[in-house]
């Protein structure tokens, strides 16, 4: 049909913190490159109906549905969603195309459904249909990658059975220790599933999709490294594949490698060897031990031996279920106001945990570092010297773990006072929790040295939000002190703070801070 306009339908995804997304359904700033939704003419429909490709949106995401119309003259439009008409304000872009937008802020279930856009141009009328649904992330999974040997080739395939299909990459590093951190220049990434270069120092495979990123390191024993004090330990669940690489370098080819499990040679088909000459003409040999699906009886000491290197072993432990081992008893710390301090949790876990640190209902990212002894450690230093309750939470596929910490900051008390017709109260959050004294100021005692002991009630209360203790002291008013100035003082090992209160004065009570 000659009269049909050229139209383009696009989806714009906005980043969650995108302040450019306005409330209007006209034209917010574009924060991501638009995704073409096709907009094909719908066959066998009465009237001219274009249908955009289905749109799947994450819960709470913000999007814009946009139509670009290349038709002469003015256009008018109307959005319809669930039988309700919505305002529509077309405008024209620099190429003189009509632009109609619908902004959906923070997607919810109620905003999912069919959005119909009716457009009337000078030449013709037509309808555009958008179907918007919430992405079912409940069906999403991200599984840790595992290795398989490529059939008839000396190569490893990296597999991650995840939904949606993940991007798989190998992360390779040829130097030792700290320089193999993710963003180091020594690290090389290869976005492919098959790896042929298996001689590197550190080999990991990572899989990533919408749920994040999971990595698996190729467990390696390097016979050229001095034997460690702690035997490396590898945990696996029943049914998972086992891969251990033994690597050795020698001045010539006159050496061989062997694997043994509990001093019995591994069966043929459970190992394969590769060798190469390095740049300085030394010989590198690697020998893989592998079991495609482990059972309980695959537990034990796997020893790699060479005629030219000290033997080394790893303890492989096959478990039925994942675990997190750590002490969950709560821990209390008290530190000075400027003292450097970090919370830390030491744990042994399989599979690797996901974790968070929480303080005052706010979550903080959690980093974990492997130690030489098979344990891992997570530290949290970003407490900014705020006293209260800090929570470490960890979980993996099979286990959960929570540990509580209390942080107290040693400081001199600071006093706040309030008074009513019948009593005066003072509050302080210093630490250690302060003790209280009340004094009466009179002609006889202008320096307020006359101590009040009658009618005083002290208590400590937990300020729930931070898990922080506040101490308070209340003085019940008696005839003997009405009309006098009284002084409440809070003191601890770091100092004293006082407030002076005029009792029974009309109007708001004046408080005089007196440190």
């Amino acid at each position: 049909n000659q009269d049909l306009p050229v139209i383009k339908c696009v989806l714009i995804n906005h980043k969650n913190n995108d302040s450019s997304v306005g409330k209007s359904s006209s034209y917010p700033m574009v924060s991501e490159s638009p995704e073409d939704l096709g907009c094909a003419l719908r066959p066998q429909s009465s009237g001219t109906v274009y249908e955009a490709a289905a749109v799947e949106v994450d819960v709470s995401a913000s999007i814009t549905l946009q139509v670009l119309v290349d038709a002469p003259g003015n256009i008018s439009c109307l959005w319809v969603f669930k039988h309700s008409s919505l305002n529509c304000q077309p405008h024209f872009d620099l190429q003189n195309r009509g632009v109609v937008s619908m902004v959906i802020l923070k997607m919810t279930e109620t905003q999912a459904g069919e959005y119909l856009l009716f457009i009337q141009s000078e030449a013709t009328n037509y309808t555009i249909l958008f179907t918007v649904s919430i992405r079912n992330t409940l069906l999403y999974t991200l599984r840790r990658p595992y290795f398989r040997k490529m059939e008839n080739q000396d190569a490893l395939v990296c597999i991650s059975e995840s939904v949606p299909e993940p991007i798989v990459e190998w992360v390779l590093c040829d130097s030792q220790g700290e320089s193999c951190k993710e963003e180091s220049p020594a690290v090389v990434k290869k976005e492919e599933k098959v790896l042929h270069e298996l001689f590197g120092t550190d080999i990991r495979c990572c899989a990533r999709n919408e749920l994040g990123r999971e990595c698996t390191r190729l467990f390696t024993i390097d016979l050229n490294q001095t034997p460690q004090t702690t035997l490396p330990q590898l945990f696996l669940k029943v049914g998972e594949p086992l891969w251990i690489r033994c690597k050795a370098v020698h001045v010539n080819h006159g050496f061989g490698l062997t694997w043994e499990l509990e001093n019995k040679a591994l069966e043929e088909g459970n190992y394969f060897e590769m060798s190469t000459y390095s740049t300085n003409r030394t010989m590198i040999r690697i020998l893989f031990a592998f079991v495609s699906s482990v059972a309980r009886n695959d537990t034990g000491y796997y020893t790699c031996s060479s005629s030219k290197h000290p033997s080394q072993s790893a303890l492989v432990t096959i478990v039925e279920k994942g675990f997190i081992n750590a002490t969950n008893s709560s821990e209390d710390y008290e530190i000075d106001q400027y003292e450097e301090f970090c919370f830390s949790v030491r744990f042994k876990a399989y599979p690797q945990i996901r974790c968070t640190w929480t303080f005052s209902r706010k979550s903080f990212p959690c980093e974990q570092k492997g130690l030489d002894n098979g344990y891992s450690i997570s530290k949290f230093c970003n407490h900014k010297h705020q006293p209260g309750e800090y929570i470490f939470h960890a979980e993996n596929d099979d286990a959960q773990f929570t540990k509580m910490f209390t942080l107290n900051i040693r400081r001199k008390p600071q006093v706040l006072a309030e008074a009513s017709a019948s009593q005066a109260s003072c509050f302080s959050d210093g630490y250690p929790l302060p003790s209280w004294t009340w004094k009466k100021c009179s002609d006889k005692s202008p320096n307020c040295t006359e101590e009040i002991t009658e009618g005083v009630w002290n208590r400590k209360a937990n300020r729930k939000v931070f898990g922080q203790w506040v101490s308070s002291s209340t003085l019940n008013m008696s005839e003997a002190i009405k009309g006098f100035l009284v002084k409440c003082c809070a003191y601890n090992s770091l100092g004293t703070s006082c407030e002076t209160i005029l009792l029974n004065s009309p109007g708001p009570f004046p408080f005089i801070q007196d440190n």
Epitope: L231, N263, Y301, T303, S305, S307, P310, S311, L315
Partner: nanobody
Framework: QVQLQESGGGLVQPGGSLRLSCAAS????????IDWYRQAPGNEREWVAQ???????FYADSVKGRFAISRDNAKNTVYLQMNSLKPEDTAVYYC?????WGQGTQVTVSS
């Protein structure tokens, strides 16, 4: 349960010799390799020597040519012969089979 017991440590003058023994029980001794480690005060534990099941021996660079490791499978014992001892050899010496460690024996080299 595997148990390892070291003996033979003591005080010796620089240039002197000592022979350490490591007796094992609860393990079929002949089927495993044995390592000697040492730990000087304030230092990490460090590997010293290894004897494999087949009798091959390996040494840390710091002791090569001075120490000799041997084994007697009939007695379930491994030996560390230490010659030309230096003050820096002062440490507690431990033997290890896989994850199992002995209690250690003190060697002090001092004039």
């Amino acid at each position: 349960q595997v148990q390892l017991q070291e003996s033979g440590g003591g005080l010796v003058q620089p240039g002197g010799s000592l022979r350490l023994s490591c007796a094992a029980s609860g393990v079929t001794f002949s089927i495993s390799y044995i390592d000697w480690y040492r730990q000087a005060p304030g230092n990490e534990r460090e590997w010293v020597a290894q004897i494999t099941r087949g009798g091959d021996s390996f040494y840390a660079d710091s002791v090569k040519g001075r120490f000799a490791i041997s084994r007697d499978n009939a007695k379930n014992t491994v030996y560390l012969q230490m010659n030309s001892l230096k003050p820096e050899d002062t440490a507690v010496y431990y033997c290890r089979i896989l994850s199992y460690w002995g209690q250690g024996t003190q060697v002090t080299v001092s004039s």
